[in-house]
Interface confidence: medium
């Protein structure tokens, strides 16, 4: 920002500057330039020998200025453009200044003035330019300071040039009041703190409803001698409930919120929240909807899920596979998990109790993410009821539970687990096992086997033990083997059909299970 102390061109000839000697030398003239009347102080005594013509400004109050800038706009005619050469013609003039605490009026004394510089044009107005009315305007700027008195004068000394002063502007520089990063910096006079420190550090204050971020630096700027702000440090952020609008913080509109001091704008209240008031820092959940502690405030409020859909229990001997589908209503969340609980009932007595300790789950039954689980080690002739509960991140905030149940009666023993113990070119040694709790119920085991691909004939062996060797087999041949428990009630569950292969006569091949 430039604070103008003196502007000759803007005064349209109303400034009555002092000329010395009076009535000779410098003269106020009017001309037309671009259809506008312009005023200029002009002198053109180029053929009258040595000249010493002075033009002194009015007294200029210094205000807060320490350094002043003097901008001159002027034309100088080429000495060669005058008939006869004008031997005493010059093409420069001198700029002076004098400080004082009072206005001396018309009392002019050269000795009080200090020379600032000789002012020379970059371009002189040659004959052709003069005749074609091409004004070769020169602009020169000088800096004076530090000033200490209340005011000052400028003076122009002509030594025989043909010169016109079209503009004399004196100003000092301020870093203007500025809003930057939501901080207000005061108008600051552009001064060098020292030769080594050309920047003045200025602290800013956060605008209304803005704060310095936690752990951050307060806003600072540097004012240069040229009146420019440089190197911003730190910042302010709009506090919670307010957002940045241009250079201010404005309260969030109703229906919007902002939960922390940040650069982000206010956010619209998410789904399933009540409309917020102006300047809200959060939006409350609608009745029946909740926010989990880890949910961001920008997330929609959610509710617990409904029960799982279509729960089925498929009995497989002493195993049950439970399958279900996701709840129809997820409550608006993705973090659904399932818990399976088990209850067993004795048909004879009708007594029931939890069975978590006696059964085995294919994976831990709490916080399941898949929609199936297999329950094994079930006892025969027992009724089981399984409950599958759907939960999400907000289920813990309500007392009600969302679950579906399925019941199953176990009538069979669990199928034996079969493995190949040994083999040769003509025999296969097979062993199996069943849960200890079921062994007392088994009378015998029936082993059925046949060549793979031969559907017309098969062999059966019965045994009370847990192993059998099948002899008289063909070498390098695959056999299909199944083991089934026989109980007092009839046949128990059969194992799955296994493929076992005898060794080739060349021997040595690995066992294939």
């Amino acid at each position: 920002k430039e604070v103008v102390l003196l502007d000759f061109a803007a005064m349209k000839g109303e400034l009555g500057w002092l000329t010395h000697p009076y009535g000779k030398g410098w003269d106020l003239m009017q001309n037309i330039m671009d259809d506008m009347p312009i005023y200029m102080y002009s002198v053109c005594n180029v053929v009258s020998g040595d000249q010493d013509n002075w033009l002194r400004t009015n007294w200029v109050y210094r205000e807060e200025a320490e350094r002043i800038f003097i901008e001159l706009k002027f034309t100088v005619r080429d000495c060669n453009s005058f008939p006869g050469g004008a031997s005493s013609c010059k093409e420069t003039f001198n700029l002076y200044y004098a400080e004082s605490d009072v206005d001396y009026g018309t009392n002019f004394q050269k000795r009080q003035f200090t020379k600032i510089d000789t002012i020379a044009p970059d371009e002189i107005t040659v004959s052709s330019d003069f005749e074609a009315r091409n004004v070769k305007l020169n602009v020169e700027e000088r800096m004076v300071g530090p000033l200490t008195r209340k005011g000052f004068y400028l003076a122009f000394q002509d030594i025989g040039a043909c010169v016109a002063l079209l503009s004399v502007r004196v100003y000092y520089k301020k870093c203007p009041e500025m809003l930057q990063s939501l901080a207000r910096f005061p108008e600051t006079i552009a001064v060098a703190v020292s030769d080594t420190q050309p920047l003045a550090t200025v602290a800013g204050t956060c605008v209304d409803h803005a704060v310095v971020p936690y752990g951050g630096e307060g806003p600072l700027m540097h004012c240069t001698v040229d009146g420019e702000w440089l190197v911003p440090i730190g910042q302010c952020l709009c506090q919670e409930g307010y957002e940045k609008v241009e250079d201010a913080c404005r309260a969030c509109s109703p229906g919007f919120f902002k939960s922390e001091a940040s650069e982000s704008p206010c956010l619209e209240c998410p789904e399933h929240t009540l409309p917020s008031t102006e300047g809200a820092t959060s939006c409350q959940c609608e009745e029946g909807y909740f926010r989990a502690p880890e949910d961001p405030l920008s997330m929609s409020c959610t509710r617990p899920p409904s029960a799982p859909n279509y729960l089925t229990a498929i009995g497989m001997g002493a195993k049950v596979e439970l399958r279900w589908t996701a709840p129809k209503d997820t409550g608006g969340r993705q973090d659904i998990v399932y818990s399976v609980t088990c209850e067993q009932c004795w048909p004879e007595s009708g007594e029931c109790g939890p069975c978590e300790a006696s059964v085995r789950y294919s994976e831990p039954p709490h916080a399941l993410t898949r929609t199936s689980v297999t329950v094994s080690d079930l006892e025969p002739h027992m009724n089981y009821t399984f409950a599958v509960e759907a939960r999400n991140g907000v289920s813990g905030l309500v007392t009600s539970r969302s679950f579906r149940t399925a019941s199953v009666s176990i009538n069979q023993t669990e199928p034996p687990k079969v493995r190949l113990e040994d083999r040769s070119t003509t025999s296969l040694s097979v062993t199996w096992s069943i849960p200890v709790s079921q062994q007392s119920r088994v009378w015998k085991y029936e082993v059925t086997y046949r060549k793979k691909g031969d559907a017309n004939s098969y062999n059966v062996r019965r045994t009370e033990g847990f192993s059998v060797t099948l002899d008289d087999l063909a070498p390098d041949t695959t056999y299909l083997v199944q083991v089934q428990a026989l109980t007092q009630e009839g046949q128990g569950a059969g194992s799955k059909v296994h493929e076992f292969q005898t060794l080739s006569t060349e021997g040595s091949a690995n066992m294939a299970v």
Epitope: D35, C44, F82, S127, F130, E131, C162
Partner: antibody, heavy 128, light 107 residues
Framework: EVQLLESGGGLVQPGGSLRLSCAAS????????MAWVRQAPGKGLEWVSR????????HYADSVKGRFTISRDNSKNTLYLQMNSLRAEDTAVYYC?????????????????????WGQGTLVTVSS | DIQMTQSPSSLSASVGDRVTITCRAS??????LAWYQQKPGKAPKLLIY???NLHTGVPSRFSGSGSGTEFSLTISGLQPDDFATYYC?????????FGQGTKVEIK
Amino acid sequence: EVQLLESGGGLVQPGGSLRLSCAASGFTFSHYMMAWVRQAPGKGLEWVSRIGPSGGPTHYADSVKGRFTISRDNSKNTLYLQMNSLRAEDTAVYYCAGYDSGYDYVAVAGPAEYFQHWGQGTLVTVSS
Amino acid sequence: DIQMTQSPSSLSASVGDRVTITCRASQSISTWLAWYQQKPGKAPKLLIYKASNLHTGVPSRFSGSGSGTEFSLTISGLQPDDFATYYCQQYNVYSRTFGQGTKVEIK
């Protein structure tokens, strides 16, 4: 009353020469810039040359540069145009025109340069 | 050189008519433009200088306007003495150039 009176026109063969004169009266001749403007039969006006109040600087239209020379004698209040290597396309009425120079000891010229005063013209015919 | 283009090249009008002639410069000439009137067998006469300034002794029915590249000369109520050829001329640079002229004839 400002008066400008041209003379020296006539018939000349291509390649020949002519010297036109313009006698000025009724104003301070030495303060005026002077010019020659011509007009071919049935055609428009064409600026030919000009000269500053004290004899310089001089300027010429490209069509006559190197063949024509403008000069003045302020003591005789007379403007001249020496025309050499004349061509058929130089056939025209030649007007002498004057305009206030503002050529004073001032830093910035004031008056504009337009043709305030005109002579009655002299016909130059270039033909074989 | 700066080219000056006048339009129209000729026009027919009656006494009392308002007539406007335009002149276009090939580049900006600020307001350094003059208008002249010429009658057959006579020297041109200055009407307007600096685009809009009326020369001494010229009737006020003549007026000029424009700046930059577009200019016009207007005769607000045509008189019998006004039937002539009108020329514009730029004097922004030394190679002063004229328009090709506009002939104003009696309808």
